[in-house]
């Protein structure tokens, strides 16, 4: 045992650079700091075999498996992967340790498996075994959290049935409206599953894992707040738990709260009450209405009444399947080059949607904001005045929705020209789509005013670049115009642009661009 070298096995994670397959290397690229793999002598194996803790990485990740050997003298080595030998070049670090590395670039399924490193030192021979697998994110899920009452306690448990197991946190806020934004100082986060302090203004539970973050707000009716102009609406799917909190504050304890569904008192076991004194000695009462698993007949108007406050109601709608309600007809917009403008989609959906905005095959993050009337809105303003087709896509567990938008930017045409032996063509992307004129420049018409009408072929939209229409006009060459300068002009309501072409033999042509506004 005393002859064995001191072995350290590490994993180095790299910021991804483009490249190919696993290769043995003595000088890995710039990377994260090494991570210890807990190499240990494998018991009951023939020969001296060290094993590193199993490694699991994302597909396309670039990593280095590295061994540091504290043993006297030189070492020689050989990597073996799937019965193939790979070259091995040990070098020595500043502490005079032997360093052997295997770089795996852009991890793929074919590069997953067992990597064996055989080392021969002056004192002994030994093997080091690395196992590398690809993380299977296909099995990952992230489900919206839901609430349960804690057994025998006035507390709520937040549950999210997700893989990998999520971190659950309560997000609490005691202010109103805008100041309850996620990063506001008024927001308090508690990384625990059970919440006892249930008197706050705004209570949400969030679950996060490698797929992202999902939150559920505790639906609340506050009898001290002015009711919304439209009745608040809560959607649930059959089988989901229903939780509504009714909250009221009064100068003393002399008031009570009750829940009714369609004018009938809720059955015992479907509500529980809590009360506390606030700092200014006023009494806060909350009354929860809850159903552990809703059915269709739990649909209706839930009314919270108080002996000292006006009643308020909420409409609970139980659906068999989730939905996304919005108008999916495509919309076209025409804006000026510096006009402020945002696309927006107004929708009603349950469960909450995940959404993206897409332009020219690039996706942009999508934000949603709840409106007072039960609708939500998603806006996209980051178009940078690029004309084309924009796509809004939304989905939840049960429904999908796509809406197309076309953005046209009003601008004067810009003309590009090209010519061949038989024709001359001009292109323009101005909007509104331009009209075309061709003019011949001659002795008789030095200002190029002689219009050409023969052999002209206009195409309103001959190619679509990311939804952007390009108009073109082609002039077929005739003997009458060969050797002359011709001018193509594109004009729309914002101005005119022209390009002058010399129609001689094929080859490069001098173009003179005229900008006439």
């Amino acid at each position: 045992n005393q002859d064995l070298p001191v072995i350290k096995c590490v994993l180095i994670n790299h910021k991804n650079n483009d490249s190919s397959v696993g290769k043995s290397s003595s000088y890995p690229m710039v990377s994260e700091s090494p991570e210890d793999l807990g190499c240990a002598l494998r018991p009951q194996s023939s020969g001296t075999v060290y094993e590193a803790a199993a490694v699991e990485v994302d597909v396309s990740a670039s990593i280095t498996l590295q061994v540091l050997v504290d043993a006297p003298g030189n070492i020689s080595c050989l990597w073996v992967f799937k019965h193939s030998s790979l070259n091995c070049q040990p070098h020595f670090d500043l502490q005079n340790r032997g360093v052997v590395s295997m770089v795996i670039l852009k991890m793929t399924e074919t590069q997953a498996g067992e990597y064996l490193l055989f080392i021969q030192s002056e004192a002994t021979n030994y093997t080091i075994l690395f196992t590398v697998s690809i993380r299977n994110t296909l099995l990952y899920t992230l489900r919206r959290p839901y609430f349960r009452k804690m057994e025998n306690q006035d507390a709520l448990v937040c549950i999210s049935e997700s893989v990998p197991e999520p971190i659950v946190e309560w997000v609490l806020c005691d202010s109103q409206g805008e100041s309850c934004k996620e990063e506001s100082p008024a927001v308090v986060k508690k990384e625990e599953k059970v919440l006892h302090e249930l008197f706050g203004t705004d209570i949400r539970c969030c679950a996060r894992n490698e797929l992202g973050r999902e939150c559920t707000r505790l639906f609340t009716i506050d009898l001290n707040q002015t009711p919304q102009t439209t009745l608040p609406q809560l959607f649930l799917k059959v089988g989901e738990p229903l939780w509504i909190r009714c909250k009221a504050v009064h100068v003393n304890h002399g008031f009570g709260l009750t829940w009714e569904l369609e004018n009938k008192a809720l059955e015992e076991g479907n509500y529980f009450e809590m009360s506390t004194y606030s700092t200014n000695r006023t009494m806060i009462r909350i009354l929860f209405a809850f159903v552990s698993s809703v059915a269709r007949n739990d649909t209706g108007y839930y009314t919270c009444s108080s002996s000292k406050h006006p009643s308020q109601s909420a409409l609970v709608t139980i659906v068999e399947k989730g939905f996304i309600n919005a108008t999916n007809s495509s919309e076209d917009y025409e804006i000026d080059q510096y006009e402020e403008f945002c696309f927006s989609v107004r929708f009603k959906a349950y469960p909450q949607i995940r959404c993206t905005w897409t332009f020219s095959r690039k996706s942009f993050p999508c934000e949603q904001k709840g409106l007072d009337n039960g609708y939500s809105i998603s806006k996209f303003c980051n178009h940078k005045h690029q004309p084309g087709e924009y796509i809004f896509h939304a989905e939840n567990d049960d429904a999908q929705f796509t809406k197309m938008f076309t953005l046209n930017i009003r601008r004067k045409p810009q003309v590009l020209a090209e010519a061949s032996a038989s024709q001359a063509s001009c292109f323009s992307d101005g909007y509104p789509l331009p009209s075309w004129t061709w003019k011949k420049c001659s002795d008789k018409s030095p200002n190029c005013t002689e219009e050409i009408t023969e052999g002209v072929w206009n195409r309103k939209a001959n190619r679509k670049v990311f939804g952007q229409w390009v108009s073109s006009s082609t002039l077929n060459m005739s003997e009458a115009i060969k050797g002359f300068l011709v001018k193509c002009c594109a004009y729309n309501s914002l101005g005119t642009s022209c390009e002058t072409i010399l129609l001689n033999s094929p080859g490069p042509f001098p173009f003179i661009q005229d900008n006439i506004s």
């Epitope: 991570e35 807990g38 094993e51 590193a52 803790a53 199993a54 893989v163």
Partner: antibody, heavy 124, light 107 residues
Framework: QVTLKESGPVLVKPTETLTLTCTVS??????????VSWIRQPPGKALEWLAH???????SYSTSLKSRLTISKDTSKSQVVLTLTNMDPVDTATYFC????????????????WGQGTMVTVSS | DIQMTQSPSSLSASVGDRVTITCRAS??????LAWYQQKPGKAPKRLIY???SLQSGVPSRFSGSGSGTEFTLTISSLQPEDFATYYC?????????FGGGTKLEIK
């Protein structure tokens, strides 16, 4: 340099819940298959294993304390969290976290690296 | 649960002595036994794992043997820095269990 560092309250009152955090560095809970356990040691007494979380999120708990213990991890923060509810003066101890590498061939080498421990006193 | 019985619970010895500590498992644990050394106010340190594999960097005077239910830790020639408490741990199955410890003191 591999380290595990325990943190949490020094003093808790009876019936309260103890929450301890083990922050690891020098290895990743995301890319490397490592389990992490919590172990405690009352003053002058033997070591007692409490709970373990595997790399795949599976958990195992001490039979006698199972109803009071919860172990979880946050790989993005390189943290493993232990909660022990309904604390009692007999829970006064030094609490350690320790890592256990998971080898693909299925054998175990037990805890190779430990944190320095954090002393927790339960008293009213 | 598997019970681990460690003996003796305390032991007095002198520098240069050969010392043996025993651990007995209530059921077969194959070779999944580790030995730890702990000094006052410090975390335990792994000496031996898988019954007989010496932890890298641990002096070769420490050795482990045994399989099934009977295991021993031997220190061939005690050094002053070896006076500490020693624990065995079965890591064959969960729940994991430690022995009660052996306090090794200077005679």
């Amino acid at each position: 340099q591999v380290t595990l560092k325990e943190s949490g309250p020094v003093l808790v009152k009876p019936t309260e819940t103890l929450t301890l955090t083990c922050t690891v560095s020098g290895f990743s809970l995301r890319n490397i298959k490592m389990g992490v356990s919590w172990i405690r040691q009352p003053p002058g007494k033997a070591l007692e294993w409490l709970a373990h979380i595997f790399s795949n999120d599976e958990k195992s708990y001490s039979t006698s304390l199972k109803s009071r213990l919860t172990i979880s991890k946050d790989t993005s923060k390189s943290q493993v969290v232990l909660t022990l509810t309904n604390m009692d003066p007999v829970d006064t101890a030094t609490y350690f976290c320790a890592r256990m590498p998971e080898y693909s061939s299925g054998w175990s080498g037990a805890f190779d690296i430990w944190g320095q421990g954090t002393m927790v006193t339960v008293s009213s | 649960d598997i019970q681990m019985t460690q003996s003796p619970s305390s032991l007095s010895a002198s520098v240069g002595d050969r010392v043996t500590i025993t651990c007995r498992a209530s059921q077969d644990i194959s070779n999944y036994l580790a030995w730890y050394q702990q000094k006052p106010g410090k975390a335990p340190k792994r000496l031996i794992y898988a019954a007989s594999s010496l932890q890298s960097g641990v002096p070769s005077r420490f050795s482990g043997s045994g399989s099934g239910t009977e295991f021993t830790l031997t220190i061939s020639s005690l050094q002053p820095e070896d006076f500490a408490t020693y624990y065995c741990l079965q890591h064959n199955s969960f729940p994991l269990t430690f022995g009660g410890g052996t306090k090794l003191e200077i005679k």
